[in-house]
Interface confidence: low
Amino acid sequence: SGVFQLQLQEFINERGVLASGRPCEPGCRTFFRVCLKHFQAVVSPGPCTFGTVSTPVLGTNSFAVRDDSSGGGRNPLQLPFNFTWPGTFSLIIEAWHAPGDDLRPEALPPDALISKIAIQGSLAVGQNWLLDEQTSTLTRLRYSYRVICSDNYYGDNCSRLCKKRNDHFGHYVCQPDGNLSCLPGWTGEYCQQPICLSGCHEQNGYCSKPAECLCRPGWQGRLCNECIPHNGCRHGTCSTPWQCTCDEGWGGLFCDQDLNYCTHHSPCKNGATCSNSGQRSYTCTCRPGYTGVDCELELSECDSNPCRNGGSCKDQEDGYHCLCPPGYYGLHCEHSTLSCADSPCFNGGSCRERNQGANYACECPPNFTGSNCEKKVDRCTSNPCANGGQCLNRGPSRMCRCRPGFTGTYCELHVSDCARNPCAHGGTCHDLENGLMCTCPAGFSGRRCEVRTSIDACASSPCFNRATCYTDLSTDTFVCNCPYGFVGSRCEFPVGLPPSFPW
């Protein structure tokens, strides 16, 4: 399907005469009839097999013909055809004089013909105009012509149908030869297959529209190249989906048991040495000059509270110095110039005279101490809590807050390692002096009975179409990772594709 276009450009009839030689009165009001037909070696009358077209009156005698194509006019003249362009043609152009407004053949005088030209030849489909000029004794006609394809038709003969589309059935435009040219982001014979995000993993990812990357089960990440570990896996990794391979220092089925508290938490301060002493427990060996469970306290000579009777201690490079309160003197403020008459006992302490009143002693109520009952008793100074327990003052008493794995008033008792049921899959737990041991049921092994040795859901090869099978250890089931083009829990169904391209 296409259009033969004829562009009339200039007609010269300087004497204003008809083909018969008779002059037009007052001038030749000229219109044209065009006949397009199949190739004839000698162009002869007969049906215009490719079509006909007539113009209105375009001018008088000699004139240029305006290009009206942009305004919806009739120049170029259009001769559409609905067949494969044969590449050859015959063309007859007649110039007629119209004395009145009726241009029908039967309304014209028999000698109204001004001129007639007939050409024939080859013409390929294309955008370029072929210019021609035909001259007779009295007239000259300048014109150009071409054949172009109708919308959606392409190729050398306008025989190839191609309609651009951007929907489920294809995403393309048409090339000049009618071949498809995929829109950006699409590929395939009919441009139905999206081009996924650059780098999207071929097996583990797919896409339904361009520049996306959708992950198959068990995979994640921008490019679907990161496997998803087993559900609940805390400190582990995987190389295929649903695995849980523990990082160094972690153990258990879900890699959630801390076997290296020292490395993971660095609890010891001030350059102390840390030693792991079981799950979540540790011991800090302090450097000289430091103390505390985590060696967080700096030792000084004043730490032993050498100053008596409320004296304040000041550290010095070569020791310490006691600043004594009024009424006391001596290296440690141990000598008193006070007597009971001066009420030296604080916090409800009772004063007792000594050495005939030259000295005195205070009897302190509970929770207070010191020569003058000036100090509140700190029952935690002796670090009574074992195994890294935290000592808390509670009025007249104290209590220990134990670390996990320990109990008792002073955290001196080890909680049974079996209390947390560490053995998986019904394994039997045995407490040992240095930890625990699991006795596993048939079909399981490993330190915690976490390894399945006989039951394997993938052993029966349940996945079809070369899909990859993964065993889910927590549910004794399998997961099939389907290759491209298959779906279903066992990848047994091919993805439905349109049987042929729908025009």
């Epitope: 450009q9 200039e10 001018g59 000699s62 305006r66 290009d67 942009s70 105009w129």
Partner: nanobody
Framework: EVQLVESGGGLVQPGGSLRLSCAAS????????MSWVRRPPGKGPEWVSA????????YYADSVKGRFTISRDNAKNTLYLQMNSLKPEDTAVYYC????????????????WGQGTQVTVSS
Amino acid sequence: EVQLVESGGGLVQPGGSLRLSCAASGFTFGNYDMSWVRRPPGKGPEWVSAINSGGGSTYYADSVKGRFTISRDNAKNTLYLQMNSLKPEDTAVYYCATPRGWGPTGPHEYGYWGQGTQVTVSS
């Protein structure tokens, strides 16, 4: 929308030169013959020069022959008129237009017109 925009006019002394330009848009310029038309003060329009669509054929009014040169650049959609040895009688508003009817001496009917550019030749 078809547009023809003339430029290059101005005041020039007798014997001087000017080059007029006509920028076309909104239609296939290379398919059209083009012409220059002028309207002297108090007179009707008169044809000056014309050129065919390809630029191979040029036509001039007797009054400007040998002094004016018409040309075109289809790639730039522009028509030109080089005017040398200007005379006071060349004073007019100059228009570019698409001829649609020709007489024995040149175009006499036009399709599209520009708005014109004033040329004044005076000492």
